[in-house]
């Protein structure tokens, strides 16, 4: 009686069970009644990672750098290149298929939160009393500077991408 | 030689449901996603949402209380199912590898008209 | 929700023009841009990831720059196979993933 279901790393093929390949291994050629599995090792700069009835491996994923990507495990005949973001870049999703530069918080913006590997850079507007008059992916926003400390008097007011300027106090004429 | 093909039903009645399948090969879905995107006759392409290679499945916002993207990795497939077609839903729906990321891959696509 | 406005929706050029397609993004996406070239009939085709980085096997008579929501796709010198519509997509996030309307370059 031929079989209808095969044990686990077996499949089913002409009304026979076959042992599957081990990962690192493709299909050369399937069993017969007298000869067993035949597989042959993934080559160089290819995979897979089950056991499986594969007649060809995968080729390893490519972290491509014009997508920000670079390698952060090297794969092996049974396992996929791993790839990561360079430093600077982030994940634009949790698969990271691919990285893009973090942003710069623009000009009346600070930096809330600096960005990760998989998160992006955290802008917040600059409050009343404090500037950024550049566009980072690191600073914050700075407070006005204090003219009364210096013994000097506000000449102009601040903004949120400007700070005040101090001008010495008006003497009084005699 | 890594490929993707659609594969499905040309024609759809509306308010029907559309199921359409993405065969990969030559690379495992464990490495990389699938994305859906179509193009109405003569319009612009449009992206509908993809699963990424951790099996995680993104929406178009617009499309997202229509869509389900699954994928069986044994199978080596992504199904896309979308509810509700309405005769605006025709389209060519291409599937590419990739998640949220660019598409250097793209199948041939499939032409689906909706229509009674 | 998240748009990008490409412009011109058409241009007429002649083999030889130095060609400029445009494409906004109502938000920054840093450097989170794709071109593609699509032929009647055909999938589209990458041309340019990463907002100025080209695709394996492209022409450099094709570059693409900006930053941020501004950004540009040029052809320097237009070869009778560059006739076709070319898209920008987004890739900076799930929430922003989203192809430009189209620009279709025609022969003068």
């Known amino acids: 009686e031929p079989p209808t279901a095969c044990r686990e790393k077996q499949y089913l093929i002409n009304s026979q069970c076959c042992s599957l390949c081990q990962p690192g291994q493709k299909l050369v050629s399937d069993c017969t009644e007298f000869t067993e599995t035949e597989c042959l090792p993934c080559g160089e700069s290819e995979f897979l990672d089950t056991w499986n009835r594969e007649t060809h491996c995968h080729q390893h994923k490519y972290c491509d750098p014009n997508l920000g990507l670079r390698v952060q495990q090297k794969g092996t005949s049974e396992t996929d290149t791993i790839c990561t973001c360079e430093e600077g870049w982030h994940c634009t999703s949790e698969a990271c298929e691919s990285c893009v530069l973090h942003r710069s918080c623009s000009p009346g913006f600070g930096v809330k939160q600096i960005a990760t590997g998989v998160s992006d850079t955290i802008c917040e507007p600059c409050p009343v009393g404090f500037f950024s008059n550049v566009s980072s992916a690191f600073e914050k926003c700075h407070p006005w500077t204090s003219c009364e400390t210096k013994d000097l008097v506000v000449q102009q007011a601040g903004t949120n991408k400007t700070d005040v300027v101090c001008g010495p106090q008006d003497r009084l004429r005699a | 030689e890594v490929t993707v093909k659609e594969s499905g039903p040309v024609l759809v009645k509306p308010t029907e449901t559309l199921t359409l399948t993405c065969t990969v090969s030559?690379?495992?879905?464990?490495?990389?996603?699938v994305s859906w995107i179509r193009q109405p006759p003569g319009k612009a392409l449009e992206w509908l949402g993809g699963?990424?290679?951790?099996?995680?499945?993104y929406y178009a916002s617009w499309a997202k209380s229509r869509l389900t993207i699954s994928r069986d990795t044994n199978l080596k497939q992504v199904v896309l199912t979308m509810t509700n077609m309405d005769p605006v839903d025709t389209a060519t729906y291409y599937c590419a590898r990739g998640g949220i990321t660019v598409y250097a891959m793209w199948g041939q696509g499939t032409l689906v008209t909706v229509s009674s | 929700a998240f748009q990008l406005t490409q412009s011109p929706s058409s241009l007429s050029a002649s083999v030889g023009d130095r060609v400029t397609i445009t494409c906004q993004a109502s938000q920054s996406i840093s450097s989170g841009l794709a071109w593609y070239q699509q032929k009647p009939g055909k999938p589209p085709k990458l041309l340019i990831v990463?907002?100025?980085n080209l695709a394996s096997g492209v022409p450099s008579r094709f570059s693409g720059s900006g930053s941020g929501t501004d950004f540009t796709l040029t052809i320097s010198s237009l070869q009778p196979e560059d006739f076709a519509t070319y898209y920008c997509?987004?890739?900076?996030?799930?929430?922003?993933?989203?192809f430009g309307g189209g620009t279709k370059v025609e022969i003068k």
């Open positions: 997509q987004s890739y900076f996030s799930s929430s922003s993933t989203v």
């Open positions: 030559g690379f495992s879905l464990s490495s990389y996603g």
């Open positions: 699963i990424g290679s951790d099996g995680s499945a």
């Open positions: 990463g907002a100025s």
